[in-house]
Amino acid sequence: IWELKKDVYVVELDWYPDAPGEMVVLTCDTPEEDGITWTLDQSSEVLGSGKTLTIQVKEFGDAGQYTCHKGGEVLSHSLLLLHKKEDGIWSTDILKDQKEPKNKTFLRCEAKNYSGRFTCWWLTTISTDLTFSVKSSRGSSDPQGVTCGAATLSAERVRGDNKEYEYSVECQEDSACPAAEESLPIEVMVDAVHKLKYENYTSSFFIRDIIKPDPPKNLQLKPLKNSRQVEVSWEYPDTWSTPHSYFSLTFCVQVQGKSKREKKDRVFTDKTSATVICRKNASISVRAQDRYYSSSWSEWASVPCS
Amino acid sequence: RAVPGGSSPAWTQCQQLSQKLCTLAWSAHPLVGHMDLREEGDEETTNDVPHIQCGDGCDPQGLRDNSQFCLQRIHQGLIFYEKLLGSDIFTGEPSLLPDSPVGQLHASLLGLSQLLQPEGHHWETQQIPSLSPSQPWQRLLLRFKILRSLQAFVAVAARVFAHGAATLSP
């Protein structure tokens, strides 16, 4: 058993069919010695008396908020949560496996630049009685500070018969060094509590591997005289690291017809302009990627040819 | 050429070669199905590689103040990786394919290190760790880790030379 936060305890349950469960001794936080009684959740039924209460925790029904009282006055609370291990594996019932980029991916994170700021998100089908708390650090043996905000519900989607909820959190490395080569990964730890179930999820990554620039901005077309060609120009996204002479992007320019089946023409360039042939009803799209490290491409920025 | 005494390197040549190194490093080891090599307990293998750290002066301001600190660090790393790529980790079994970019990568590391330091001048180089994996699968894993680490290193080096070529060239 360990303390998650004040008056909240996690009982680790290694479960198998005939598992004996965990013996837990709760102590009432009071100088009083006599006349102490214990209750569970909202029930007024007395479970036991005395300064300590011993319980055998074997299933979720044994967890909950245990309260000690004296003469109708509440002395202290202890909320017991269960963290279940089955076949040597901690349960992952609360969050949905996003399966991208690989199986057992519960947390996904992205950064728009090298400033040490990143966003992580996760999915669940649970709508109520759900709380998250997020901690992060750079490295684990001698951790350096990363500050995370509160996790917030960022999107709701309907998937078939189920509703899916997306939560996200923003974190910022306290002493980021954008130009350095990372040698220690960022660790992100999410505590999830649903009713009386506790689970924790972790992700470990280098900022360089989760970089995804915003799409290029100010995408413009300039027709070239007496030609079907146009000059496409764009700018670095505002959120990208500066100076651009140091933090450089490379770009992919695509001409796409109305029909998805039509052949796409693609040009790769390090410049912020390109000359392409504009077909009728086609659109021109541009996306960006770090020039020197193959992390994710940005989403496309698009303009119609007409 | 970057003479240790303090003259400027051929920024544009270094830029071109370092960008080529980036391309080669990624073609030698593309993202292998997002194989997470950090899960494979690599502390003892890739912790010994020289990293371009915060205090090495490789940021834009540090380069403006005195690029020599940074160039020395990059040179150290290039020599280190050049030795690793020439070691039995890469020459032993399983043999690299004949068209593997590792050979070109090895030659380009050497080429860039020579651009930074002409013969006759010596910067301190880092001792290469004695890594001699016995099993072919260990060697394969080590290659992946070294190439992943090299990708990060050459990305920073390429940024340094691109910025130098744009802002510090005579």
């Epitope: 479960w15 569970l40 039924e45 319980i55 299933e59 979720f60 029904g61 269960l82 089955e86 | -």
Partner: nanobody, 126 residues
């Protein structure tokens, strides 16, 4: 999934006693509460007793006569029935709830339960 198997039913004289057992298997860690319900011919299934950890609750009609208890080690719940009356004649069902209610009295509602046993017949002859 949770499986529940009742036993101990039978024919008993009015004023006599019976002890019902309900063995649970499967993913029993997910259980929040267990309960006993009964159904007499032509009647609705009604609540008898429930247990969660050390908490117990009873319907007014059996209070003081029936006792629900739990053997943690054996994953079994018992219903000790004393001073039986002819109106206690019914099929007795064991149920398990895997939903959490902070108000324990919610476990006296039939729709709070997710898993049910096949039932055991109790006949009290006068």
């Amino acid at each position: 999934e949770v499986q529940l198997v009742e036993s101990g039913g039978g024919l008993v004289q009015a004023g006599g006693s019976l002890r019902l057992s309900c063995a649970s298997s499967g993913r029993t860690f997910s259980i929040y509460a267990r309960g006993w319900f009964r159904q007499a011919p032509g009647k609705e299934r009604e609540f008898v007793a429930a247990i969660r950890s050390g908490l117990t609750t009873y319907s007014d009609s059996v209070k003081g006569r029936f006792t629900i208890s739990r053997d943690i080690a054996k994953n079994t719940v018992f219903l000790q029935m004393n001073s039986l009356k002819s109106e206690d004649t019914a099929v007795y069902y064991c149920a398990a709830a895997v939903n959490y209610f902070t108000d324990f009295t919610d476990y006296s509602k039939r729709d709070s339960y997710d898993y049910w046993g096949q039932g055991t017949q109790v006949t009290v002859s006068s």
